[in-house]
Interface confidence: medium
Amino acid sequence: QPSVSPGEPSPPSIHPAKSELIVRVGNEIRLLCIDPGFVKWTFEILDETNENKQNEWITEKAEATNTGKYTCTNKHGLSSSIYVFVRDPAKLFLVDRSLYGKEDNDTLVRCPLTDPEVTSYSLKGCQGKPLPKDLRFVPDPKAGITIKSVKRAYHRLCLHCSADQEGKSVLSDKFILKVRPAFKAVPVVSVSKASYLLREGEEFTVTCTIKDVSSSVYSTWKRENSQTKLQEKYNSWHHGDFNYERQATLTISSARVNDSGVFMCYANNTFGSANVTTTLEVVDKGFINIFPMINTTVFVNDGENVDLIVEYEAFPKPEHQQWIYMNRTFTDKWEDYPKSENESNIRYVSELHLTRLKGTEGGTYTFLVSNSDVNASIAFNVYVNTKPEILTYDRLVNGMLQCVAAGFPEPTIDWYFCPGTEQRCSASVLPVDVQTLNASGPPFGKLVVQSSIDSSAFKHNGTVECKAYNDVGKTSAYFNFAFKGNNKEQIHPHTLFTPRSHHHHHH
């Protein structure tokens, strides 16, 4: 007996053998699926599906909602379909009013017809308003009307499906198009503060603001170089269409030193990503660091001004500042101000303005500052440079001539003899004795020097000059001598004290 090789399996046959069938409302729908391996009938319209395991599908009284695609499937998974229109003059459109469109994509207005023989199947604006000029659509009686390349401007557009039935225009229920925007830029991210400085145990809270066109933007706080999931809270707001804002707040209720580091707020959408960082520094205790803006040893000339300036870092903020001299606190002449008005500022400046300083006002000037955790201070040693002043010039009973001068820096005393009536004293005389009188006294006052020469060395009439000088200037005093026979006489009443010109020395 010859063997018969079976052919390829074929799809089922449907009776009536048409691709489309029009049935009047109230009439019967009778569809027969012919296939030895029949499995089921499936009916689909909009989001509705029904199944029937009988090979004959019978709907005794057809309704408009029976319009749709009827598919017969066999055991090989092959199928055949017929589309049935149930013509109902009272219900021209089947509608699913949910209408979402993704920007730049096509979207389907789901209003399939129950009568394929109507004309002018199209979209119309609500209340007679025209559709946007650039709106393009493609009608399909079995599916609805496809809007091509949805624009953001179509959001909240109200429209109807429309068709002419027996010369009259019929409108479907209204549709409101909701446009889901496409991401065309990376999210905009910002942070409440770029850096935070806290003490251990204080709360760290930082807010990242993410702005984008829709809420499907992704955002998270991350710790740099760490995979640990951070605890964050979200606030979110729609500030109108396509204007979405989210606030992601990261909180560490009791910060520890090892929480210090860089925290990144990261956001992304389908277009790309963006991030912003903030730095946290946690210290176990507050601190103050003082930086002198001038040398702490200051030399200033008599009568001149000087400003003592410090910059300092203080965290927490400084509570008490003062300038002190000789155990006295300045109530004026100083100012203290933040280096910047930035909320995160920890740097401050303090200035003490000393004016027309006298020789007696040298000494230690101290700046003290404190906050709730620590105290700190810095001292300036101020030396006032003064021209020598000759305090005394005498002929002692033992025949010595003595000159005492004071000034800062320490004066040097030189002696000169002028024979006769010469005005220029050039011959220098070596002193017998030189002493610094107050070297062990206060360190910042004028220094007193005493110098003596032996007057018995002078054999002629003349003048003796005592000249005291330092870096600032010089001062001279004179002793006049006259010989009467063999007696030498110092003429005190006519002794001249003539300050000479002095020069300033600036440091």
């Epitope: 809420s215 979200y234 606030n235 979110s236 500030h239 804002e245 606030q247």
Partner: antibody
Framework: QVQLVQSGAEVKKPGESLKISCKGS????????IAWVRQMPGKGLEWMGI????????LYSPSFQGQVTISADKSISTAYLQWSSLKASDTAMYYC????????????????WGQGTLVTVSS | DIELTQPPSVSVSPGQTASITCSGD??????ASWYQQKPGQAPVLVIY???KRPSGIPERFSGSNSGNTATLTISGTQAEDEADYYC??????????FGGGTKLTVLG
């Protein structure tokens, strides 16, 4: 001080329309959202929707979308809740409540409430 | 939408601590607030941003929120605290939702 004063009680028949109001004072009305909250007799609070008076941007709870309309007139610092066709099931106390703006530390709390408007719908 | 579940009632003796819970899927990731409503009155905010108290609210009211549960705690409960309490959260889409409410009864 901040105050939200609501319009008086209403008795209506099914199918009638209604518009109730909520007037804000003592703060910048345009910068705070106004929410509407329903409380049916003996029941809990239900959030209906919210409006930002500055630009009249509204958001509705899915349960109330299409059932009511929320609006505002910033020139008179007043928000409104309206129905085009009342049903017996709309009988309830309706509260308006102020919601601080997005950047506020107290978001999203309803920090001040009106005294409520009782709406009774009965044939 | 998020659903919030509260116990219908909680009873407490005067001076004792009352805890009212509010559970919902991952509500710890958003802020919770709590409202007190006495009969015939409008609700009053008692806790916002999980654990912050508005001015004028006694210190005995406190809140917490993590995981799937927010909790309102009233320590040293007083007779005047007897009321209905509602929790509320607002989701990413800015839709707010209230819990079903808890009737707090102060015994005695």
């Amino acid at each position: 001080q901040v105050q939200l004063v609501q319009s008086g009680a209403e008795v209506k028949k099914p199918g009638e329309s209604l518009k109730i109001s909520c007037k804000g004072s003592g703060y910048s009305f345009t910068n705070y959202w106004i929410a509407w909250v329903r409380q049916m007799p003996g029941k809990g609070l239900e959030w209906m929707g919210i409006i930002y008076p500055s630009n009249s941007y509204t958001l509705y709870s899915p349960s109330f979308q299409g059932q009511v309309t929320i609006s505002a007139d910033k020139s008179i610092s007043t928000a409104y809740l309206q129905w085009s066709s009342l049903k017996a099931s709309d009988t309830a106390m309706y509260y308006c409540a102020r919601v601080p703006p997005g950047g506020s530390i107290s978001y999203p709390a309803f920090d001040h409430w009106g005294q409520g408007t009782l709406v009774t719908v009965s044939s | 939408d998020i659903e919030l579940t509260q116990p219908p009632s909680v009873s407490v003796s005067p001076g004792q601590t009352a805890s009212i819970t509010c559970s919902g899927d991952n509500i710890g990731s958003i802020y919770a607030s709590w409202y007190q409503q006495k009969p015939g009155q409008a609700p009053v905010l008692v806790i916002y941003r999980d654990n912050k108290r508005p001015s004028g609210i006694p210190e005995r009211f406190s809140g917490s929120n993590s995981g799937n549960t927010a909790t309102l705690t009233i320590s040293g409960t007083q007779a005047e605290d007897e009321a209905d309490y509602y929790c509320s959260v607002t989701d990413m889409e800015q839709h707010s939702v209230f819990g079903g409410g808890t009737k707090l009864t102060v015994l005695g």
